[in-house]
Amino acid sequence: THLGIRLPLRSGLAGPPLGLRLPRETDEESEEPGRRGSFVEMVDNLRGKSGQGYYVEMTVGSPPQTLNILVDTGSSNFAVGAAPHPFLHRYYQRQLSSTYRDLRKGVYVPYTQGKWEGELGTDLVSIPHGPNVTVRANIAAITESDKFFINGSNWEGILGLAYAEIARPDDSLEPFFDSLVKQTHIPNIFSLQLCGAGFPLNQTEALASVGGSMIIGGIDHSLYTGRLWYTPIRREWYYEVIIVRVEINGQDLKMDCKEYNYDKSIVDSGTTNLRLPKKVFEAAVKSIKAASSTEKFPDGFWLGEQLVCWQAGTTPWNIFPVISLYLMGEVTNQSFRITILPQQYLRPVEDVATSQDDCYKFAVSQSSTGTVMGAVIMEGFYVVFDRARKRIGFAVSACHVHDEFRTAAVEGPFVTADMEDCGYNIPQTDESTLMTGRA
């Protein structure tokens, strides 16, 4: 996923929400797979910022070499820096590992902007602030890269948590999470709580700040409020979902819902922004501008390029609308909505802000590869990747940034007919899985 706006962080037909309450589903509490309740050893195991990605500490090799690894639900390779690079503090030294096995195979991953390439092997891998297990996993040792590593990001590799279908060089390369589940008794589920700062952090603060939690094997109830709502994973490649309706401050964009998912909609922790297909982006920006029309901002701001700065503490959050995405529910003709605040989609930029100013970038941008629900969406929610039941859950995050007037929300159910029609069917070609550009 390339955060850049792919961080790697890569920044309709639905009927009106009649408010008709469908019969409550069987309480999901009794049905969730995995360990329940508290995963205290995994809470707060992520660090980072939405603009440069969230990373977890991992160890590779014997004796263990510690590296910080970007958590990326938009790709499927475990790849680590394995040669000196100006932006890397440390890198994986295969020659020092007695358990390294060379697969004698190369891998090349191009992005829209930039690329990485390396050599495939396997080694022993563990997550110090994760489950108490060690697994043998495929590792791509990155030997050359361009515009991949980010100066000052503090991570040295990437953990692709999506499915084998999009692994490089092909789907025969087992992703890390598949290896983990196969080799241990860990349930096939993980969950992410990404905690945006909500205010600019300088370098020292950023390194010291808590970024969130990756819970491997289950759900931690301390990380969310309210209930979890689930949307089906449409296809196991990316974490693909279906959006059935989009609202800005409660106003329906009134587009054919296929447009929202053209050519797919994915949940991607390795992308900074909420990225929307061109037509949807244009309609959304028009609506956001109209909702905040008491102020006028420069054209470059809406392109995600210029920063708008307010005197510290005076950001007028109230003039910006909320954005609601309605997702297909688990029950026929039922949807639920997730609502984010400007505190999520206006991203604080640390390097230009002074003690006098709070500066922000507009973190909704245009995409040619479908909707990408990146960090700015995920920072509002606790997101459960329930692979075992082929579904993704959303609940209001206990750490999301809000104000005294509005909060992020996950609400439902809403009656929405013909939701299956909202999915876009990508014409199958041999090249279809080669589109990894995440800029």
Epitope: K296, F297, P298, D299, G300, Q306, V308, C309, V352, C359
Partner: antibody, heavy 120, light 108 residues
Framework: QLQLQESGPGLVKPSETLSLTCTVS??????????WGWIRQPPGKGLEWIGM???????WYNPSLKSRVTISVDTSKNQFSLKLSSVTAADTAVYYC????????????WGRGTLVTVSS | EIVLTQSPATLSLSPGERATLSCRAS??????LAWYQQKPGQAPRLLIY???KRATGIPARFSGSGSGTDFTLTISSLEPEDFAVYYC??????????FGGGTKVEIK
């Protein structure tokens, strides 16, 4: 052709309020693509942005002057105004009004400027 | 806060010569930079915006280049009316309040 013209007293006493008006001719101040701003230049020195206003009344000020500055707009007269309170000799400058265009970022059209001297 | 540093402070050249003025930002401003010309007793005039786009009515001898932190205004062949003070301004951070200190181009 759009033109901007500053007007107001050329001499203001210390501690008093400096008041200037910019009259826009040849076009409407209510056209939505522009902010309207004030910039000053002390004698022999560089340019200092004071603040700007949108026709809706939305204002942005230089933090270093914010406590003393008020910019207002009168769309019926096609004018916008600057008030700077509690002036001192350091506020002596040529005051320019300007249009903020080109994607609402750059000062693409300027008035001729008016010299305001603060002296008793 | 982003600081713009212009150099040299004064440039002494003859008509017909090429003038190269520099503006350096303390951190990246992408391509959101403008150049203004100010003649004695006159208001500034926008010459270049977005680092390299000429404003309406500006002669082709004026050109701007650069992105990130280093920017250049070039006057390919100085005309007598080009002797003036030139200011750069960044608008990467908005509102547009940051100007450089100016470069005076004087007749040698």
């Amino acid at each position: 052709q759009l033109q901007l013209q500053e007007s107001g007293p050329g001499l203001v006493k210390p501690s008093e309020t400096l008041s200037l008006t910019c009259t826009v001719s040849g076009g409407s101040i209510s056209r939505g693509s522009y902010y309207w701003g004030w910039i000053r230049q002390p004698p022999g020195k560089g340019l200092e942005w004071i603040g700007m206003i949108y026709y809706s009344g939305s204002t942005w000020y230089n933090p270093s002057l914010k406590s003393r500055v008020t910019i207002s707009v009168d769309t019926s007269k096609n004018q916008f105004s600057l008030k700077l309170s509690s002036v001192t000799a350091a506020d002596t400058a040529v005051y320019y009004c300007a249009r903020v265009g080109h994607g609402i970022s750059y000062f693409d059209l300027w008035g001729r400027g008016t010299l305001v001297t603060v002296s008793s | 806060e982003i600081v713009l540093t212009q150099s040299p402070a004064t440039l002494s050249l003859s008509p017909g010569e090429r003038a190269t003025l520099s503006c350096r930002a303390s951190q990246s401003v992408s391509s959101y930079l403008a150049w203004y010309q100010q003649k004695p007793g006159q208001a500034p005039r926008l010459l270049i915006y977005d680092a390299s786009k000429r404003a309406t009515g500006i002669p082709a001898r004026f050109s701007g280049s650069g992105s990130g932190t280093d920017f250049t205004l070039t006057i390919s062949s100085l005309e007598p009316e080009d002797f003036a003070v030139y200011y750069c301004q960044q608008v990467y951070t908005w509102p547009p309040r940051t100007f450089g200190g100016g470069t005076k181009v004087e007749i040698k």
